[in-house]
């Protein structure tokens, strides 16, 4: 690689070589001075070219010298402008300047970009006393240039509260391209054209871009960085990326993958959590969502009987938590579940079915037909009634609970009784005379106690008087008269 | 607009040589390489290769090296295509076209029909 | 090199008709290009990356494939599309066309 020094806009050349200004480190240096630490740099400059003051800050002094001549205007010595070199590379420059012996104290300061170069930087300034003047040399060197050190660098001197300050010298750190801006993994929708972008800059510039697609180059001529690729749609997964070249060589962005959206895989792992008389309570496992987020699930749930009609109930729910309650089953059922989940793209197959079953429940109506008698001549009441319908039992009938309040001069007495569950009539002893009798049955099962039936009140009359008329609620939607044998 | 204008028709004997012309305007030439495209009389469309217009780099399909030639002058916008020794198997229509991304030959010239006869 | 086979070689229909053109590659390609050709004339393109009309091209033409199976759909044929119609492939070089279909007109 060539390392190059130009002064610039300078009437006369710095140093003889290949062109007005310039340094290859191919060739040896006019005068190169060794480091303490025996590292050679790549460049060096030295102080001690021919030189003029530059039109800078200068220093005027106002001493006269014993023969009362007027001292020269202080002035860094002129030196390189403009330093190009590769990255790694070592570099050293320099500022240097006569001051005369009557200044004391006189220390140079090196900034970059405006800023004081302070502490870890080799800076190194050393003085050549002379009878009248002392030159004064700093050098500031890197050893592995990096672009971090591209700037402006001069040098400051502090004398009589003047400030001199130097031409500037500029660094510029060339390499390989850099990456500013490369292609993103993305997920497409199939043939659909979307957008890749890929910036490099150097130095040197100017950099130029060439677009990678499976490994077959898009572009067969360069594009200027920064390069916007149009994909015009794709139909199955592809690694993009770019190539960034520039006269030091070249650069390859990471490969990205593009991948194309499509239909989710089914859930997997669907599971019973928990079951109740009327609710069950799933969860499941989401399959590959195909590059494309889940919107929501249906969960559909059918009959297991082989008897029933086969109809599918569907509850739809969002893709999270992955757990759904199903409500309004029947208990003591079999049921077939299974999940199917959405994405933009559409719905997945449905997961594989499972089998789960409700439990036993209260039932969810009262008995029928509740009729009331009182049987004088035992001084009992009667109770009659039919079973709630079979499907509404909601699970093995164990009993019934009969309520019977006793109502009398404002005193009020319930009492309740269990019966087993074959017969559908029960009798209980008249507890009050002169009083109202109410009854209310609930059917029973092992999943707990149902509603009561509507009250059916019958009057229990003092001693004597006898009633023979039956009270008794008629069945739901029956208009028929009851018959009592 | 964008065109690609070819030079004419021409009559060569064979071993002779021909020199065909592909002058572009209507976009920066140094940005899209120049293909080459031949069809020989009844036949189909035969790649020749291309010219990469930015570095001045040839690249020539199997069948067309040799006797074949690519070059450009970018100042004044055009590809040349050069064929010497001319066999009668030469006689053909010729085509430049614009390569763009993908290979696509998005503009074409008019052809420019060599035919080679003794 | 990619060899590019398209059939029919010739498709004989009628205006109005459905035409379906095949181009299958010898392995797989990333994208496909379309070119009409009509009789002395230079060919145009017509289906730019499988599946994207070139410019001025009406909608009756459709591309369509992946891998190595490509086709070139005209929903309706007009009296102007009977012409020959080359596939060209873009995966890897040479950059190769296909033998080409002529449709006629029945």
């Known amino acids: 690689a060539i390392t190059e020094a130009r002064e610039e806009a300078k009437p006369y050349p710095l140093f003889p070589g290949p062109f007005p200004g310039s340094l290859q480190t191919d060739h040896t240096p006019l005068l190169s001075l060794p480091h303490a630490s025996g590292y050679q740099p790549a460049l060096m400059f030295s102080p001690t070219q021919p030189g003029r003051p530059h039109t800078g800050n200068v220093a005027i002094p106002q001493v006269t010298s014993v023969e009362s001549k007027p001292l020269p205007p202080l002035a860094f010595k002129h030196t390189v402008g403009h330093i190009i070199l590769s990255e790694h590379k070592g570099v050293k420059f320099n500022c240097s300047i006569s001051v005369p012996n009557i200044y004391q104290d006189t220390t140079i300061s090196w900034w970059k970009d405006g800023k004081e170069l302070l502490g870890a930087h080799h800076a190194i300034t050393q003085f050549y006393p002379d009878d009248e003047v002392t030159a004064i040399i700093a050098s500031f060197s890197i050893t592995s240039v990096q672009r971090s050190d591209n700037g402006s660098y001069i040098c400051k001197m502090k004398i009589n509260n003047e400030e001199i300050v130097s031409d500037p010298i500029y660094i510029e750190v060339q390499g390989l391209p850099h990456f500013t801006k490369q292609p993103e993994s993305m997920n497409v929708t199939r043939n659909t054209a979307f957008n890749l972008t890929c910036q490099a800059v150097g130095p040197p510039e100017p950099v130029n871009i060439f677009w990678v697609q499976n490994s077959s180059r898009v572009n067969e001529q360069p594009e200027k960085s920064p390069s916007v690729l149009t994909v015009p749609g794709l139909t199955e997964m592809a690694v993009f990326s770019c190539e960034a070249h520039n006269d030091k060589g070249l650069t390859v962005s990471k490969g990205v993958q593009i991948n194309i959206k499509a239909i989710p895989s089914p859930p997997t792992e669907v599971s019973i959590r928990n079951s109740t008389a009327h609710s069950i309570l799933i969860s499941w496992v989401p399959g590959f969502d195909g590059y494309s987020p889940f919107r929501n699930c249906s969960i559909q749930v059918k009959e297991a009987d082989p008897l029933s009609n086969g109809s599918v109930m569907i509850f739809n729910t969002s893709a999270l938590p992955h757990l759904y309650q199903i409500k309004q089953l029947q208990a003591l059922a079999n049921y077939s579940i299974g999940v199917s989940c959405m994405n933009e793209i559409g719905w997945s197959a449905v997961s594989p079915w499972i089998l789960a079953s409700t439990t036993e429940g209260a039932p969810s109506v009262a008995p029928l037909n509740v009729t009331v008698f009182l049987n004088e001549s035992s001084d009992n009441v009667d109770i009659r009634w039919m079973k709630p319908p079979t499907k509404q039992q909601d699970g093995e009938l164990v009993g019934y609970r009969i309520s019977h309040v006793w109502q009398s001069a404002g005193i009020s007495k319930e009492l309740l009784e269990e019966v087993g569950q074959n017969g559908s009539r029960a009798r209980i002893s008249v507890q009050v005379h002169n009083a109202t009798c109410t009854v209310r049955i609930a059917a029973v099962t092992r999943g707990g106690v149902g509603p009561f039936s509507d009250p059916v009140k019958i009057f229990i009359p003092a001693h004597g008087w006898v009633d023979y008329a039956p009270s008794s609620t008629p069945a739901p939607g029956n208009a028929d008269p009851v018959l009592i044998i | 607009q964008v065109q690609l204008v070819q030079s004419g028709s021409e009559l060569k004997k064979p071993g002779a040589s021909v020199k065909v012309s592909c002058k572009a305007s209507?976009?920066?030439?140094?940005?899209?390489?120049v293909h080459w495209v031949r069809q020989a009389p009844g036949q189909g469309l035969e790649w020749m290769g291309w010219?990469?217009?930015?570095?001045?780099?040839?690249t020539y399909a199997q069948g067309f090296t040799g006797r074949f030639v690519f070059s450009l002058d970018t100042s004044v916008s055009t590809a040349y295509l050069q064929i010497s020794s001319l066999k009668a198997e030469d006689t053909a229509v010729y085509y430049c076209?614009?390569?763009?991304?993908?290979?696509?030959?998005?503009?074409w010239g008019q052809g420019t029909l060599v035919t080679v006869s003794s | 090199e990619i060899v590019l086979t398209q059939s029919p070689a010739t498709l004989s229909l009628s205006p109005g008709e459905r035409a379906t053109l095949s181009c299958r590659a010898s392995?797989?390609?990333?994208?496909m290009h379309w070119y009409q050709q009509k009789p002395g004339q230079a060919p145009r393109p017509l289906i730019y990356?499988?599946?994207n009309l070139a410019s001025g091209i009406p909608a009756r033409f459709s591309g369509s494939g992946s891998g190595t199976s490509y086709t070139l759909t005209i929903s309706s044929l007009e009296p102007e599309d009977f012409a020959v119609y080359y596939c060209?492939?873009?995966?890897?070089?040479?950059?190769?066309f296909g033998g080409g279909t002529k449709v006629e007109i029945k």
């Open positions: 209507g976009y920066t030439f140094t940005n899209y390489g």
């Open positions: 076209t614009r390569g763009t991304r993908y290979a696509y030959m998005d503009y």
């Open positions: 010219i990469n217009t930015y570095t001045g780099e040839p």
């Open positions: 990356a499988t599946s």
């Open positions: 060209q492939q873009w995966s890897s070089n040479p950059r190769t």
């Open positions: 392995s797989s390609v990333g994208y």
